[in-house]
Interface confidence: medium
């Protein structure tokens, strides 16, 4: 179960939102906060460990999901094209 | 799954190359692709990689601030660009697909057949 | 850098180990790479530590323990005779994640 702790948005660059969320999350053993379907989820600590955040399903149904290259996040494509970038800190 | 490389050829100090992998057998826009390169009677070495939209790309430190890599998901074409060319970056280039989506020297799964580069005056 | 012997050798039947150590990324494994003339392309014979290609014969197998990394070939056989490099990712701050093999392994099949 997660619950999320804070939610700053901040919108004021054209075209571009920065969201920055924090989630607890009460995890089984061999498991620790992550991101699922875009929602805070229990996931397999091995995944954080080897920073393949994709095997998360991160992205919402129907988008891509894409580990960037420096493995510090993800992106989601939208069927249309659109991306969304999310960076792991 | 079949990878095809072009390109190559006898290339001048200094100048430019563009090779192009052309993929097919998969479903091209959802694997990360990269180039590795191999010298006359040397081993592997990495050249770079790029995600599967194209939105990012990393470098071997060699080719760092001269190669390019990009894509073009509608023609399942990858395509590295190397300027000012050096006698060094004469060898034998391959193009590799990633498995499972990400692609790492560990998780390469198919090779093209490569495309030989010879820098020389 | 991977370290990899420069060479090991066989005769055919026999069990073959060829050991990888080194490298920056452990979680993302280690893969191998059969390369049989310096003209031709490597084939993939192990990716992600043990996840065998399903055109590679089951005889070909990845193990790890600790940093070291393992390429067993189980009942080796003529057409085996190759050069085999290992892969992993190493770690810079300057580049980032980049791939880096060994130097290569011969295998000789007596």
């Known amino acids: 179960t997660c619950e999320i702790v804070t939610l700053d948005r901040d919108s004021s660059q054209p075209r571009r939102t920065i969201a920055r969320q924090t989630a607890r999350c009460a995890c089984r053993k061999g498991q620790i906060a992550g991101t699922t379907r875009a929602r805070p989820a229990c996931v397999d600590a091995r995944i954080i460990k080897t920073k393949q955040w994709c095997d998360m399903l991160p992205c919402l149904e129907g988008e891509g999901c894409d580990l960037l290259i420096n493995r510090s996040g993800w992106t989601c494509t939208q069927p249309g094209g659109r991306i969304k970038t999310t960076t792991v800190s | 799954v079949t990878l095809d490389e072009s390109g190559g050829g006898l290339q001048t100090p200094g100048g430019a190359l563009s090779l192009v992998c052309k993929a097919s057998g998969f479903t091209f826009s959802s694997y990360q692709m990269g180039w590795v390169r191999q010298a006359p009677g040397k081993g592997l070495e990495w050249v770079g990689v790029?995600?599967?939209?194209?939105?990012?790309?990393s470098y071997g430190s060699a080719v760092k601030g001269r190669a390019t890599i990009s894509r073009d998901n509608g023609q399942s074409t990858v395509r590295l660009q190397l300027n000012n060319l050096r006698a060094e970056d004469t060898g034998t280039y391959f193009c590799a697909k990633g498995s499972a989506s990400y692609i790492t020297a560990a998780t390469i799964d198919a090779w093209g057949h490569g495309t030989e580069v010879i820098v020389s005056s | 850098a991977l370290t990899q012997p420069s060479s090991v050798s066989a005769n055919p039947g026999e069990t073959v180990k060829i050991t990888c150590s080194g490298g920056g990324s452990s979680g993302y494994g280690y893969g191998w790479y059969q390369q049989k003339s310096p003209s031709s392309a490597p084939l993939t014979v192990i990716?992600?530590?043990?996840k065998r290609p399903s055109d590679i014969p089951s005889r070909f197998s990845g193990s790890k323990s600790g940093s070291t990394h393992t390429l067993t070939i189980t009942g080796v056989q003529a057409e085996d005779e190759a050069v085999y490099f290992c892969?992993?990712?190493?770690?810079?701050?300057?580049?980032?994640?980049?791939?880096?093999f060994g130097a290569g392994t011969t295998l000789t099949v007596l």
């Open positions: 790029i995600n599967k939209s194209g939105s990012d790309t």
């Open positions: 990716y992600w530590n043990d």
């Open positions: 892969g992993n990712d190493d770690y810079s701050s300057d580049s980032g994640y980049v791939g880096v």
